[in-house]
């Protein structure tokens, strides 16, 4: 069989849900000496990137600025060792967001509800969508899907206190586009004194793992660049549509 | 945003050489990744070749390489693609495209990376 080098890990910088018209950053992470990275869009080559000097970093960052529908999709990315190219990474979904509309979030029976409650969220957007979205923040990648004509539901079914936080949905365009997203609705449950404080509460940055950990190289870094490499592909669990 | 506009095509007998030049308006000239692309008649615009911001990385589309050269003078607002042993197939509407990208060793392979055109030169080569 031909001999490939490991596959790298593709990321998106902050978040991989990009505001129309505003820059996204793709992180290649590769290998030490790679002399070229190439990211892919939709199966076709998009960009090309060559380091320099290429043995002093072990990844890319590629921009795509003017964010738009064009530019969203599947990404995935591969890169060269003298002329030996890694496997494809696996694949990232690219969403550009604030397209056309604003949805309206709502929660039933209300925002403050007690804990082992039915809760349902509603989204609704009285443009032509059937797609809507709903997302916790801190948990961007944990999408919820649900299809409606102008309103979607989403049943939460009995909620814990794991479900505090602040949700907002998006109507969807197709898998890739997406719309404005709704105003926050902050849900709290409450539950016995001791579950209450105990619960963790939610992060409102972006997902921590929505970072670029691209390195530059020291003598020890060469030896162990392999290993964590290959270290990291397997540990690094993917999101998909 | 800036403007592109194309010189330098006409029609030439196979095996000769052109020259195409793109003018670059405004002064953020070397900020920009720069493209040439074709379109024959009755087929989809495709990629020749490409050159970063200050000029470290170049690529070209394998039917070209070796044969057509890109290079830019970012003093001059100009990126040139130098065409040599021009064969028929070679005929086409040829486009400069730009683009703002932050690294200085990128470049946009995809129609979709490019978000400024110029309007083209027309290119014929005959036999």
């Known amino acids: 069989p031909k001999q490939t080098l490991p596959k790298p890990i593709i990321r998106a910088e902050s978040t991989y849900m990009v505001p129309k018209e505003k820059q996204a950053t793709l992180c290649c992470q590769g290998s030490y000496g790679a002399v070229e990275y190439q990211l892919h869009f939709e199966g076709s080559l998009f960009a090309v990137e060559r380091p320099k000097p290429p043995e002093r970093i072990n990844g890319v960052k590629f921009h795509i600025p003017d964010m738009n529908s064009r530019k969203a999709g599947r990404y995935s990315c591969i890169y060269r060792v003298g002329e030996l190219w890694s496997e494809r990474s696996d694949l990232l979904d690219l969403v550009v967001t604030e397209m056309y509309d604003t949805p309206t979030l709502s929660v039933h029976p209300g925002p403050e509800v007690t804990s082992g409650e039915k809760v349902t969220f509603y989204c609704r957007l009285d443009t032509a969508t059937s797609m809507f979205l709903l997302l916790k923040e801190g948990r961007s990648r944990d999408v919820q899907r649900s299809y409606g004509k102008v309103q979607a539901e989403f049943p939460m079914g009995p909620v814990t206190t794991a479900h505090r936080g602040s949700y907002r949905c998006f109507g969807s365009y197709n898998n890739y586009a997406w719309s404005f997203p709704s105003e926050p609705v902050k849900l709290l449950v409450t539950g016995d004194i001791e579950n209450t404080s105990l619960a963790p509460t939610d992060p409102t940055f972006p997902d921590s793992w929505d970072t670029c950990l691209l390195t530059r190289e020291t003598g020890l870094q060469k030896d162990l660049a392999l290993w964590d490499h290959t270290a990291q592909n397997h540990h690094h669990h993917h999101h998909h549509h | 945003q800036v403007q592109l506009v194309e010189s330098g095509g006409g029609l030439v007998q196979a095996g000769d050489s052109l020259r195409l030049s793109c003018v670059a308006s405004?002064?953020?000239?070397?900020?920009?990744?720069m493209g040439w692309f074709r379109q024959a008649p009755g087929k989809e615009r495709e990629f020749v070749a490409a050159?970063?911001?200050?000029?470290?990385?170049?690529y070209y589309a394998d039917s070209v390489k070796g044969r057509f050269t890109i290079s830019r003078d970012n003093a001059k607002n100009t990126v040139y693609l130098q065409m040599n042993s021009l064969k028929p197939e070679d005929t086409a509407v040829y486009y400069c495209?730009?683009?703002?990208?932050?690294?200085?060793?990128?470049?946009?392979?995809?129609?979709?990376?490019?978000?400024?055109w110029g309007q083209g030169t027309q290119v014929t080569v005959s036999s």
């Open positions: 495209a730009a683009d703002r990208y932050s690294s200085n060793t990128q470049v946009g392979v995809a129609r979709t990376y490019y978000d400024y």
């Open positions: 405004g002064r953020t000239f070397s900020t920009y990744a």
């Open positions: 050159i970063s911001r200050n000029a470290d990385t170049t």
